[in-house]
Interface confidence: low
């Protein structure tokens, strides 16, 4: 007899891993035998789509290898002519073992700013993301959390979030872990120690220290007075991130002299930047009522031109007087190399006699100048070009420091040796008459400022110019 | 594929030094903690040393502290056991290996991939 | 340190049995148990992790379980390839690990 169809299992909810089988029955009962049909989502599951098979007169529906998207509802319909069509529906559940589908990757962040690990997950149930950090799970606080997407979000990156991260995703099907990712934080350069303000005498030494810190290491440039310090010695020491650098001068003038720290982010910089200032105790050059003493030269740029144990004027004013004036020399002396073979030997007369002056001693030792006649005899003879230049440079403001004030004597303040033979200091190395006069370049001026008179060889004195008369 | 290859075994005397190195490819020993285990002659498998992920972290079996150094350069991905102050007993098979995961969190994962092993004899 | 004690230490099985090998911990451990099958002259093989997980690739006639100290390593079905020597292992601490004695599977 003729029998309407009737599902005599209806279907159930089928639960899948990816990748595998999943099949839906479907068990009718009816006469004639019915033509069953099935649908994904109300859509037509054709009986060629090569991804499912359809067995037992259709009564077998199966998945051959399921896929994340065949989640849905299944429904198989029976009808064989007779009574109505009947109806079974049941769902697939695609169960998945954890998956990272965007796992996290190396990120360089500075400090304070906020860091975002990324790790979106796939699987069903629904992973729960963790996180490690070196060999230890990673704990929530106020900063750092585990957002719902699994990313990681830390706040206000701190030094010590640095480290290595990796992701895990877990559930009842599996666990699955991430590479290892690395988050450096960098740090903006910072001073730690800033140089110290100084107010010292002319001549001494001083050195400012400046520690900074920062990740990258940062790296230290002195500025003095606006331009980059090239005199003085600098040392630096690095350790546990800190860079320490000390600069050692030697002070002739007043200055500022500022610290700058620098490291860098990518394509940015970080600067830090600390200043002192240095300052001359009653600055205001050398004074005429300078103090000192009398010893012998035991230098050694001046050997040569000194006479042999000649006494000279050590002037107190210095921390170390001879240090202080032999470093004035050596400057000076440096400055030398480029002037002509004929200025060199009397420039090199004038300088040390007139640093290192020639010492009248007494209850009160006291320096005795050089005699202007000599010094012009420098200025307008030997070395006329260089004077100019050196000149034209101390009016334009191109010398560092005031050493060279140091160096070069006014002339017309040193007193003549016509006033009194014995109170101002020759030259011996200048020794020449008139006549010789022709082989030296031409004058610069028409006509001498003063006469210079035949200067007479002295092998008693040493030559010798104070501070005291020298500046402008 | 990943693979680890040990080298540098070999017959020494007691008291010398050798040192064994494990090439790693098919990932990146900064990404995973390297052990070094042992088998004497007939012998069970004994833990010797390793070293973590971070490389700021290095482990002893009290049998060789003091004695074995164990290091990593990542840019040749490669591990080393360094042995020093070698004795008749350390005489073994000395087999690298990969812990699989980060340690036992969330899970201990165990050593999934070991190398062939590198024979060490130590004899006068 | 933690002691892996391996019982028995060696056992004869033929094919199709039921063997059971079983670790017990001095002191109280995690789950940070796995177990090793090694053939000789080869190196050890990873079986089961985490106590009771099957790594990849591992026949499901191998299970492990734990019950408090004990951990147990299970072949449901022996097969003439599972003849080999088995170890437990234990990490305690991130990094230091311990093997129990071994068990070796011969056939009978």
């Known amino acids: 007899l003729p029998k309407a169809p009737v599902i005599t299992t209806p279907l159930e909810t089928v639960d899948a891993l990816v990748e595998e089988v999943a099949t839906f029955m479907c068990a009718v009962e009816s006469y004639p035998q019915p033509e069953i049909s099935w649908t994904r989502n109300k859509i037509l599951i054709k009986l060629f789509d090569t991804r499912y098979s359809i067995r037992e007169n259709g009564q077998l529906l199966t998945i051959l290898s399921v896929e994340d998207s065949d989640d849905g509802i299944y429904c198989c319909t029976a009808n064989n002519g007779v009574g109505g069509a009947v109806e079974s529906c049941g769902a697939l559940q695609v169960k998945m073992k954890p998956k990272i589908t965007r796992p996290p990757i190396n990120v360089k962040i500075i400090e304070g700013l906020k860091a975002v690990l990324p790790c979106t997950t796939m699987g069903n149930p629904k992973p729960s993301v963790s996180w490690i950090k070196g060999d230890s799970p990673l704990r929530e606080n106020s900063r750092i959390a585990v957002l719902e997407s699994g990313s990681l979000r830390i706040h206000n990156v701190q030094k010590e979030d640095a480290g290595q991260y990796r992701c895990v995703a877990k559930n009842s099907l599996g666990t699955a872990y991430s590479k290892v990712v690395k988050l450096e934080v960098e740090v903006f350069a910072r001073i730690l120690r800033a140089p110290e303000s100084h107010n010292v005498t002319f001549g001494s030494f001083v050195t400012l220290h400046c520690t900074a810190t920062g990740i990258p290491v940062p790296t230290i440039t002195w500025i003095e007075n606006g331009n980059a310090v090239s005199s003085g010695s600098i040392q630096e020491s690095v350790k546990d991130r800190v860079i320490d650098s000390r600069l050692q001068l030697f002070i002739t003038k007043p200055g500022l002299y500022t610290c700058i720290a620098t490291n860098k982010h990518g394509e940015k910089f970080s600067t830090a930047k600390a200043a002192a200032t240095i300052s001359i105790a009653e600055w205001s050059k050398p004074q005429k009522d300078n103090k000192g003493y009398c010893a012998q030269y035991r230098g050694e740029v001046c050997n040569a031109v000194l006479a042999k144990d000649a006494l000279v004027f050590l002037n107190t004013s210095y921390a170390d007087p001879e240090e202080a004036q032999e470093l004035l020399v050596h400057t000076a002396w440096n400055e030398l190399k480029v002037v002509s073979p004929v200025c060199r030997p009397a420039a090199e007369a004038l300088l040390c006699n007139h640093i290192f002056q020639e010492c009248s001693p007494g209850v009160v030792p006291t320096p005795i100048p050089i005699c202007r006649e000599y010094c012009l005899a420098v200025k307008e003879l030997f070395c006329a070009k260089e004077w100019l230049v050196m000149e034209e440079k101390t009016h334009r403001g191109l010398y560092r420091s005031e050493m060279h004030l140091l160096s070069v004597p006014e002339c017309s303040k040193l007193p003549s040796m016509h006033w009194d033979p014995t109170a101002c200091a020759r030259l011996p190395h200048l020794d020449y008459n008139k006549e010789n006069l022709k082989t030296f370049p031409p004058m610069t001026s028409s006509k001498p400022s003063v006469d210079i008179p035949n200067l007479p060889s002295s092998s008693s004195s040493s030559f010798s110019v104070s501070p005291t008369y020298s500046m402008t | 594929e990943v693979q680890l290859v040990e080298s540098g075994g070999g017959l020494v005397q007691p008291g010398g030094s050798l040192r064994l190195s494990c090439a790693a490819s098919?990932?990146?020993?900064?990404?995973?903690?390297i052990h070094w285990v042992r088998q004497a002659p007939g012998k069970g498998l004994e833990w010797v040393a390793s070293i973590s992920s971070s490389y700021s972290s290095t482990y002893y079996a009290d049998s060789v502290k003091g004695r074995f150094t164990i290091s990593a350069d990542t840019s040749k991905n490669t591990a080393y056991l360094q042995m020093n102050s070698l004795r008749a007993e350390d005489t073994a098979v000395y087999y690298c290996?990969?812990?699989?995961?980060?340690?036992?969190?969330?899970?201990?994962?165990?050593?999934?991939?070991w190398g062939q092993g590198t024979l060490v004899t130590v004899s006068s | 340190d933690i002691q892996m004690t391996q019982s028995p230490s060696s056992l004869s099985a033929s094919v199709g049995d039921r063997v059971t090998i079983t670790c017990r911990a001095s002191q109280s451990v995690s789950s940070a148990v796995a177990w090793y099958q090694q053939k000789p002259g080869k190196a050890p093989k990873l079986l089961i992790y985490?106590?009771?997980s099957l790594y990849s690739g591992v026949p499901s006639r191998f299970s492990g379980s734990r019950s408090g100290t004990d951990f147990t390593l299970t072949i449901s079905s022996l097969q003439p390839e599972d003849f080999a020597t088995y170890y437990c292992?234990?990490?305690?601490?991130?990094?230091?690990?311990?093997f129990g004695q071994g068990t070796k599977v011969e056939i009978k």
């Open positions: 290996a990969r812990l699989a995961g980060l340690y036992h969190y969330p899970g201990y994962l165990g050593l999934d991939y």
């Open positions: 098919g990932f990146t020993l900064y990404s995973s903690s």
């Open positions: 292992q234990q990490s305690s601490r991130s990094s230091l690990l311990t």
């Open positions: 985490s106590a009771s």
